[in-house]
Interface confidence: low
């Protein structure tokens, strides 16, 4: 009887996103050792990295990865063709764009080639594991004497992303943040002309095209206004 362990991995949807299945074993041996969990992220729907902690193995082992898509035209078992390495031991696999099918259940299998019965299979919803590139080309426009508009671009279809804008002045202890939908623009209605503002943005593949939890990296910051830093008692704490 196969053991099936249901494990949450931070992208719960309507059904479990991740199932771990281990092969049965007759006796207590190396084959009972659990294999490391595989974590996959799809970067901007350009490539996907599936990685595991190779150092969790009791001795250095070149684990192998196979994958397929459940109940689809792409259900043929594929071997990893591009391994990632950590200290000359396999620690991941990179899949290219043509091998990524966001809306079909992705099945990934890790195996110990020296002990073929020692294997683990996970099922993942890739649309919940997309991480977009950071927003680019931030621009600020003065709409009126006291109103600023921030615009940015993403290297992805705009309607698939939501955004988080953070801004602060040189006098602020912390960032103020505002969620923004797919329209990728943000207005700040009341700007103090005596202060210097910093803005930054990050994006997430949610909610229209997937339910990803992970945000992109922050954009490069963009600044606006007077540089009053010399008189600012909080500056060094902010930049530390």
């Amino acid at each position: 009887l196969n053991t099936t362990i249901l494990t949450p991995n931070g992208n719960e949807d309507t059904t479990a996103d991740f199932f771990l299945t281990t092969m049965p074993t007759d006796s207590l041996s190396v084959s009972t050792l659990p294999l490391p969990e595989v974590q996959c992220f799809v970067f901007n729907v350009e490539y996907m990295n599936c990685t595991w902690n190779s150092s969790s193995e009791p001795q250095p082992t070149n684990l192998t990865l196979h994958y397929w898509y459940k109940n689809s035209d792409n259900d043929k078992v594929q071997k990893c063709s591009h391994y990632l390495f950590s200290e000359e031991i396999t620690s991941g696999c990179q899949l290219q764009k043509k091998e990524i099918h966001l809306y079909q259940t992705f099945v990934v299998q890790l195996q110990d080639p020296r002990e073929p019965r020692r294997q683990a299979t996970q099922m993942l919803k890739l649309q919940n594991l997309v991480i977009p590139w950071a927003p680019e080309n931030l621009t600020l426009h003065k709409l009126s004497e006291s109103q600023l508009e921030l615009n940015w671009n993403n290297r992805f279809l705009n309607h698939c992303l939501e955004h988080l804008v953070q801004y602060r002045t040189d006098w602020d202890h912390s960032w103020t943040e505002q969620s923004v939908d797919y329209r990728h623009k943000f207005s700040l209605p009341s700007v103090d002309g005596q202060k210097r503002y910093t803005f930054r943005v990050r994006s997430r593949f949610n909610p229209l095209c997937g339910s990803a939890q992970h945000w992109s990296e922050w954009s490069h910051p963009i600044h606006w206004g007077s540089n009053t830093s010399k008189e600012n008692p909080f500056l060094f704490a902010l930049e530390a």
Partner: nanobody, 120 residues
């Protein structure tokens, strides 16, 4: 030959309803999330609703509670029930597999679309 055919559009008064249908060939439909897109004059095409092969649905905020997307996997059909229509819903409506749109946005083949006009 990959094909998409949208139908069901028309002229309707504000507050009225329409049901759009999309027939898709199996190679587009099978196992894919399907989306309804719209393009108003002078604007970019935007996704308004999507449905996965398992039936999970997503909507853009402006249509939530007014539009309902559904699919019939046996017939390779996708539907968009539109109610409480507003003038700003006026656009040509298209359907497509979301993944095809992501993978090759510039080259994704589109159906003819169906015109929805909301006006009194």
């Amino acid at each position: 030959q990959v094909q998409l055919q949208e139908s069901g559009g028309g002229l309707v008064q504000p507050g009225g309803s329409l049901r759009l249908s999309c027939a898709a060939s199996g190679s587009i439909f099978s196992g894919n999330a399907m989306g309804w897109y719209r393009q108003a004059p002078g604007k970019q095409r935007e996704l308004v609703a999507s449905i996965t092969s398992g039936g999970d649905t997503h909507y853009v905020d402006s249509v939530k509670g007014r539009f309902t997307i559904s699919r019939d996997n046996a017939k390779n059909m996708v539907y968009l029930q539109m109610s409480s229509l507003k003038p700003e819903d006026t656009a040509v409506y298209y359907c497509n597999a979301q993944e095809r749109v992501y993978s090759d946005y510039a080259f994704a083949s589109w159906g003819p679309g169906t015109q929805v006009t909301v006006s009194s």
